[in-house]
């Protein structure tokens, strides 16, 4: 209209999606009596009443706001409950009297978007790609107005670059009003983005301010050719015979090529390849010192055929040959000496070392060992070790038994063994000496002879304990080329108050044994009655 | 309007070679990537081969060897060849679109069958 | 590769009837799932993406939740056109889908 002033701009509200907007009505006492007000809203230029007040009364209009207005501040104040986008609108309030006057209000409306979505390409982007591929897309869900997203890489804002990162943002409105973005990070990636970080970041305001919301950061698989093929042995460091070895062939490229691991053949000066498993990889184990050798891979694009050799690998299985010892099977006389050798081959400097076999005490460090003026008692075994110190647990053993001639040599003079008439006696005795002896009973019974080792004999007998038996007692005899010798068995009989109570005399059964390690006096073991203490 | 439509042959026999076209319609090749699934008879979906909108190809690890997969972008095609067709390769074979990484779309695909 | 374990197998469920399909991934792939449903003869059809969005011209009766492994489409009144097989699937890492899903009316 001609000559009036230019409306002034409209005062803004803001608020958020779902909360009240108070529209407080601007004019001033002398542009309207705040008592008869009409309020409209503004869309698309066509104003609509919405609400009437008079004499300080508020009555809505039928309509989309019908059920959310009310007065409020002394009928200064309308109340708009539940705002939704489509409020966002202008509203005027029109005073009546004395002329028509109207203030405008810009709504403002605000919502959040929900926590940015963000999804990686599944199937991965390779490096050679002829365009920017999408790399990942970010959604954020019922945001008002639209947000705005950045999509960062290792922490920098990704930038648009021709032909490098392209991107793509669309939008679409929900039933609610509300927007849900969604954007496409287009891009050529290269080798160095394997490890890169992409995340997205929503900016969006809200009646208090401008806020951001990111996405979790996600890495992208990243497709590459291979340049360099390489062998990794395990374990790390000096392999021996028994180990379990893995030779396993790496490439730097994404996915890894096809391989292929062949060993040099000296005889032939060919290569050839070995069986790996399901993965490439090829165990060895347990690893014998024909494994050693030098080992190389091919690794293979199956595209394009085109193959890589890796530079090749010395691999080295220590070992211990078999000990050999000199003489094999030594016999010797009473008082003689004996030289021992010990021999073996390696892939390293050996150690030597002499035990004894029974008591496992070194006796030399060295491959040789010499014994002088040999007693009975040097008989036995002994063990040649040869080692390699520079590597734990690589070694070989070999036992010798030296044999002492002599006459038999018993396990027990003489010994006492309680008994009940009648009852089936098992008997035991055991003699030792070189030549092997045999043994003798002075007895009937059932006798049974067993090796103890090559110089030893045990035999046992079961008898039936008589009158006469217990009269005579029980013999048993060893003899061989070099001698004879004797042990006597007592018999006595126990009376049941020598019994202690837990002794088990159900089986009628005494056994009686020398043990192996005992050669001066007897012990019984299993059900041997127990010596009364009267006896001494 | 979005439309995806697979063809090639019915019946192909074992050791032949399969090829499959997938000719699409109301979008670009160049702006949406297109699988193929297939489905044997009483059997899961299962995934084959993909060409992206970039032309960067991708193939099910299980059949990588015997799998080509190409498009021509004027024509708005997508081929599919599959080498040493076996009897167990008997499916329902379908094409679909990315949008972007999801399969938004779908032809209603073809049955082949792999008998001598 | 990832596995998708659907359940059950197959339901039978009455006209009107809330319908409750299960999902579950063998590692996390957040909300990088989707359902479709097949009908013999018909374009396969997708339903939810995202783990819970709808797609457009979808039935609102047709809802999906859950990240992570564990994911749920529900059908909140079965109505007779939905008797289908639906089908979950990852799109994590590579493609995978899950056994499948048979739904048949009482």
């Known amino acids: 209209v001609p000559g009036e002033a230019e409306q002034p701009a409209p005062e803004l509200v803001e608020v958020e999606v779902g909360s009240t907007a108070l529209l407080k009505c601007g004019l001033s006492q002398s542009q309207g009596n705040l008592s008869h007000v009409d309020w409209f809203s503004v869309h698309k230029e066509k104003r609509t009443l919405i609400f009437r007040v008079r004499q300080g009364q508020g009555q809505s209009e039928p309509g989309e706001y019908e059920q959310r207005l009310s007065l409020q501040d002394r009928g200064a104040t309308l109340a708009l409950t539940q705002v939704t986008p489509q409020d966002e609108r202008i509203f005027l309030c029109q005073g009546k009297r004395p002329r028509s006057q109207e203030y405008r209000i810009q709504l403002r409306v605000y919502k959040a978007p929900e926590e940015p979505n963000i999804q990686v390409n599944p199937l991965g982007i390779p490096v050679n790609s002829k365009e920017p591929e999408e790399v990942a897309t970010c959604v954020g869900r019922n945001g008002y107005p639209i947000p705005q997203v950045i999509w960062y890489k290792n922490g920098r804002p990704l930038k648009e670059e021709k032909n490098r990162v392209h991107i793509q943002s669309s939008q679409t409105v929900e039933s609610s009003g509300l927007y849900t973005l969604q954007s496409i990070l287009k891009a050529q990636l290269v080798k160095e983005d394997k490890d890169a970080q992409f995340y997205c970041e929503l900016n969006y305001r809200l009646p208090s301010g401008n806020h951001m919301k990111e996405s979790r950061e996600v890495t992208v698989p990243v497709f590459y050719p291979t340049e360099k093929v390489w062998l990794e042995v395990e374990p790390v460091g000096m392999l021996k015979e028994g180990d379990r070895v893995e030779i396993r062939c790496l490439a730097d490229g994404n996915p890894p090529p096809h391989f292929s691991i062949s060993k040099g053949n000296p005889s032939t000066r060919e290569a050839e390849e070995e069986t790996t498993n399901d993965n490439g990889v090829l165990v060895l184990e347990p690893a014998r010192k024909e494994h050693s050798g030098r080992y190389e891979c091919q690794a293979w694009n199956l595209d394009t055929m085109i193959s890589l050799l890796s530079e090749p690998q010395e691999l080295l299985v220590n070992y211990v040959s078999d000990v050999r010892v000199s003489p094999a099977a030594p016999e010797r006389q009473e008082g003689s000496s004996l030289t021992l050798t010990c021999e073996a081959e390696s892939s390293q400097d050996l150690e030597f070392q002499w035990l004894r076999e029974e008591t496992d005490q070194v006796l030399e460090r060295g491959p040789v060992l010499q014994l002088h003026d040999l007693k009975r008692e040097a008989g036995g075994g002994y063990r040649c070790v040869a080692s390699v110190p520079s590597i734990p647990g690589l070694n070989r053993t070999q036992l010798v038994k030296l044999a002492i001639f002599g006459p038999p040599w018993m396990a027990f003079k003489e010994r006492k063994v309680w008994v009940k008439e009648n009852m089936v006696l098992n008997l035991s005795c055991e003699a030792s000496g070189h030549p092997r002896p045999t043994i003798s009973w002075n007895v009937n019974g059932t006798a049974s002879e067993g090796d103890q080792d090559p110089q030893r004999v045990l035999s046992t007998l079961n008898v039936l304990v008589t009158p006469e038996l217990l009269e005579t007692g029980v013999e048993c005899t060893a003899s061989n080329d070099l001698g004879k010798n004797t042990s006597i068995l007592f018999l006595e009989l126990v009376n049941l108050t020598t019994l202690t109570p837990d002794s088990n005399t159900t089986t009628g059964l005494s056994t009686s044994t020398a043990s192996p390690h005992t050669r001066a006096n007897s012990t019984s073991t299993e059900r041997k009655l127990p010596e009364p203490e009267s006896r001494g | 309007q979005v439309t995806l439509k697979e063809s090639g042959p019915v019946l192909v026999k074992p050791t032949e070679t399969l090829t499959l076209t997938c000719t699409v319609s109301?979008?670009?090749?160049?702006?949406?990537?297109v699988s193929w699934v297939r489905q044997p008879p009483g059997k899961a979906l299962e995934w084959i081969a993909a060409i992206s909108s970039g032309g960067s190809t991708y193939y099910n690890s299980a059949f990588k060897s015997r799998l080509t997969i190409s498009r021509n972008t004027s024509k708005s095609q997508v081929v599919l060849t599959m080498t040493n067709m076996d009897p167990v390769d008997t499916a329902t074979y379908y094409c679909?679109?990315?949008?972007?990484?999801?399969?938004?779309?779908w032809g209603q695909g073809t049955l082949v069958t792999v008998s001598s | 590769d990832i596995q998708m374990t659907q359940s059950p197998s197959s339901l039978s469920a009455s006209v009107g009837d809330r319908v409750t399909i299960t999902c579950k991934g063998s590692q996390n792939i957040y909300k990088s799932l989707a359902w479709f449903q097949l009908k013999p003869g018909k374009v396969p059809k997708l339903l939810i993406y995202?783990?819970?969005s709808l797609q457009t011209g979808i039935p609102s009766r047709f809802s999906g939740s859950g990240s992570g492994t564990d994911f749920t489409l529900t059908i909140s009144s079965l109505q007779p056109e939905d008797v289908a097989t639906y089908y979950c699937q990852q799109y994590y890492s590579g493609y995978t889908f899950g056994g499948g899903t048979k739904v048949e009316i009482k």
């Open positions: 995202d783990a819970n």
């Open positions: 109301g979008f670009s090749l160049t702006s949406n990537g």
């Open positions: 679909a679109r990315h949008r972007p990484f999801y399969f938004d779309y």
